[in-house]
């Protein structure tokens, strides 16, 4: 039975040209995390394999940085980065857990940042 839950940064906003940390946290399970995929609807941004380390898709290599932890830092944001992002936790023996983050990239210099992510 899958007992885990994923906590995410939820809906966040950031300024064009700035950077943002996408962060998820899996809790309430003893399952082993084997891999975390960071994805948009139709493409892979990055993979963090617990054993093999990071893979970053070439189209994002110049503006995505791995971490902190299993999170992902998006840099040099453009309005085209607005949209849904998914953290997909591959675990054993539970299976797959998915978290969703909505990022809005604002033209304005007064972008209101969502509450900072905290792991309780």
């Amino acid at each position: 039975m899958m007992t885990g839950t994923i906590e995410t940064t939820g809906n966040i906003s950031a300024e064009k040209g700035g950077s943002i940390i996408l962060q998820c946290h899996l809790s309430s399970t003893t399952a082993q995390v084997t891999q975390v995929n960071w994805e948009q609807q139709d493409q892979l941004l990055a993979i963090c394999n617990a054993d093999l380390g990071w893979h970053i898709s070439p189209s994002f290599k110049d503006r995505v940085a791995p971490g902190p932890g299993l999170g992902l830092t998006l840099q040099s944001l453009t309005v085209n980065d607005t949209g849904e992002y998914f953290c997909i936790y591959h675990t054993y023996p539970d299976g797959t857990y998915t978290g969703r983050i909505f990022l809005e990239v604002l033209e304005s210099s007064v972008a209101e940042h969502g509450a900072r992510f905290q792991i309780p």
Partner: antibody, heavy 119, light 107 residues
Amino acid sequence: QVQLVQSGAEVKKPGASVKISCKTSGYTFTEYTLHWVRQAPGQGLEWIGGINPNNGGTSYAQKFQGRATLTVDTSTSTAYMELSSLRSEDTAVYYCAGSGYYDYSFAYWGQGTLVTVSS
Amino acid sequence: DIQMTQSPSSLSASVGDRVTITCRASQDVKNAVVWYQQKPGKAPKLLIYSPSYRYTGVPSRFSGSGSGTDFTLTISSLQPEDFATYYCQQHYSTPFTFGQGTKLEIK
């Protein structure tokens, strides 16, 4: 330039073990993940597993879990693959392959090591 | 495990022909697919990755496309040195798996 040079051909009896080396040069050893792939005569490519020289983390295909052991020696920039309890079906060319920085594509390949298992 | 199925298994073509090889994943692998070329007695060589980027030194006649479960490798105008076996591979999740290969032969 990046080079992966493997040890020479081996002939082994069923039940024995074989250990193949892959000496790397031309890059910082701990930056690239190293994988092992095999190819039986006339057959396709099969991923055995990979190792991250930075932390020694290993990932194996289920089929080889417990029978293959991947290790590295960072002092000599060399990776090793040991396969135990050999059987005739393990007769194959074994390749080491390196994937680049933050990348899982196998950009660099050794020349291959033929392992023949025969009684 | 994710299965990668290539078609066709073998293909006869002539120099100058346009050739397309397809690869289908058993589940969504986004854009985490690469293509290799292998000649007899030699190690494979990386051709295309992610899945439309040509690796360094690969001629522009090679191109890749696709996302999700369906991927293609296209050679726009076959050259004599292109006759080889081609493999797709997914690296979306371990174990990394290869297609069974497509052998491209001279007609």
